[in-house]
């Protein structure tokens, strides 16, 4: 069945997304499968449902089990299952395999380690990073947004990296940690001045007022692993984070590599409930690497 494994540590926050995705307007009901008991939506509960998300604030070992989410459209009900396991905190430094997220590989040119699942949480920078339980110190390590960059990667940088951050829910803070292995590989490649594939410069996109729309900024930076390759959106020349409009959210950049070996990154700007004032903004797609910065501008117009 449509099922997803999720895990966490006791006394930490855990947020799980329903594996059955639907449109944002669809209702999502959550149940504890063993008892068929409905999960409450009131935020005063330690475990509560919030649309597509199931929140354990904080999690307890007894929360382990299978949770059912039913996504309801006007004519279809679709079911997903979240298999949740909450573990006791380890007394020593060792992080067991069952608490590890997917392994990532890096090279001298590309040493980004993303903090797993962080996009589900309401967190603020900076992240804390640990390698084999030791806090990372020194200028080689740069905590940037939701990832860690290591300068001049060497083979002994391989190991288990843990990110630690604070999730905030209605003024209360909860700790979250996530660990993944990092391996180092030797890779031949090259980097170029960024090439923006989309949008075209000075493009205009037609949108419906009141509807949702997505803008994709897609750029390529060369072949093979890239040391620095950033794709982001700006609004009227300002960072999205500085633009206090919760309807407009930028997704974490998704790495993409094509059959021709080009290393590209896509970053999506999601605009919910498009308003007239959004048509007045200038949307800049920025692609930056060590060679320089390229900018393409797109504007919105009413359909």
């Amino acid at each position: 069945k449509f099922s997803k494994q999720s895990w966490g540590l006791e006394n930490e926050a855990l947020i799980v997304r329903c594996p059955r995705q639907g449109k944002s307007s669809y209702i999502v009901d959550w149940y504890y499968s063993q008892t068929n008991k409905s999960i409450p939506t009131q935020e005063r509960n330690r475990v509560f449902a919030s649309g597509q998300l199931l929140k354990f604030l904080p999690a307890e070992v007894a929360d382990s089990g299978i949770y059912t989410c039913i996504v309801r459209s006007p004519t279809f009900n679709r079911t997903g299952y979240a298999n949740v396991t909450i573990y006791k905190k380890q007394p020593d430094c060792n992080v067991p395999d069952y608490l590890m997220y997917s392994t990532v590989s890096g090279s001298e040119k590309n040493s980004k380690i993303y903090c797993p699942t962080i996009d589900l949480y309401n967190w603020t920078a900076p992240l804390e990073w640990f390698k084999n339980c030791q806090a990372l110190q020194g200028s080689r390590y740069k905590a940037h947004k939701s990832f860690l960059v290591i300068d001049n990667v060497m083979t002994d940088d391989a190991g288990d990296y843990t990110c630690k951050f604070i999730h905030n829910e209605n003024g209360a803070n909860y700790s979250v940690t996530a660990t993944r292995s990092f391996t180092v590989k030797d890779e031949q490649g090259f980097s170029l001045f960024p090439v923006i594939r989309a949008p075209a410069h000075n493009e205009t996109k037609e949108v419906e007022i009141g509807e949702n729309t997505n803008l994709t900024c897609s750029a390529c930076f060369g072949k093979g692993a890239q040391f620095l390759a950033t794709v982001q959106w700006q609004l009227n020349g300002n960072k999205i984070t500085d633009f206090s409009e919760p309807r407009i959210q930028q997704e974490e950049g998704q790495n993409q590599s094509f059959s021709n070996g080009l290393a590209c990154v896509n970053t999506v700007l999601r605009i919910a409930d498009v308003k007239e004032e959004d048509l007045l903004l200038r949307y800049d797609c920025l692609a930056l690497n060590l060679h320089g910065l390229r900018r393409h501008t797109i504007r919105l117009s009413r359909k």
Epitope: K1, F2, Q21, K23, S73, T75, F76, T213
Partner: antibody, heavy 123, light 106 residues
């Protein structure tokens, strides 16, 4: 009531072009992905092309890639299929159908279908 | 692409009998599988989605089961209007249809 009505089929010579239309009513057209499916005479169903609700995502079956173009005009509640470089094996009844769930770029079932329009490619 | 193989190609049964139709996928499609009914000169009609859920207005005699690569459509007691061609469709990776099973009157 949801209704889909295809038009634009007919007889065309190999190498020729045809544009199919599908007029939709009874639902918020821009909310849903739309799909073209075809059925050669006496044969099974073959998926042809997909377009997301806002028109930003399109997919094609390998058999039509580079020759067919799917598009939509949400202001007119109309779906299109531009068919170029037509071949004898494109002869089929072409159905437009609604994918009522699909988030942009994903697929689901087809809950409403048009009655189909026949395309015959022959010299 | 994911290939769906339906069996048997033809099923000859009498009204009131139980019909069991099979659909096998070349790789796992989780439960992203649907069943359709098509009568001559008509467009297909959705019966089952997500392998086992009946679409709105579909009689209870139609049921679906399976997950992964092996799926079954069961018609518990055939009515005269059930004699038609049945197609399975996967939507896990793009869309593909099976080649169809014809249920005909014996």
């Amino acid at each position: 009531e949801v209704q889909l009505l295809e038009s634009g089929g007919g007889l065309v010579q190999p190498g020729g072009s045809l544009r199919l239309s599908c007029a939709a009513s009874g639902f918020t057209f821009s909310d849903d992905a739309m799909i073209w499916v075809r059925q050669a005479p006496g044969k099974g169903l073959e998926w042809v092309s997909y377009i997301g609700g806002n028109g930003g995502t399109t997919y094609y079956a390998d058999s039509v890639k580079g020759r067919f173009t799917i598009s939509r005009d949400n202001s007119k509640n109309t779906l299109y299929l531009q068919m170029n470089s037509l071949r004898a094996e494109d002869t089929a009844v072409y159905y437009c159908a609604r994918d009522p769930w699909s988030t942009e770029g994903s697929f689901f079932v087809l809950d409403y279908w048009g009655q189909g329009t026949l395309v015959t490619v022959s010299s | 692409e994911i290939v769906l193989t339906q069996s048997p190609a033809t099923l000859s049964l009498s009204p009131g009998e139980r019909a069991t139709l099979s659909c096998r996928a070349s790789q796992s499609v989780d439960d992203d599988l649907a069943w359709y009914q098509q009568k001559p000169g008509q467009a297909p009609r959705l019966l089952i989605y997500d392998a086992s859920n009946r679409a709105t207005g579909i009689p209870a005699r139609f049921s679906g089961s399976g997950s992964g690569t092996d799926f079954t459509l069961t018609i518990s007691s055939l009515e005269p209007e059930d004699f038609a061609v049945y197609y399975c469709q996967q939507y896990n990776d793009a869309i593909t249809f099976g080649q169809g099973t014809k249920v005909e009157i014996k």
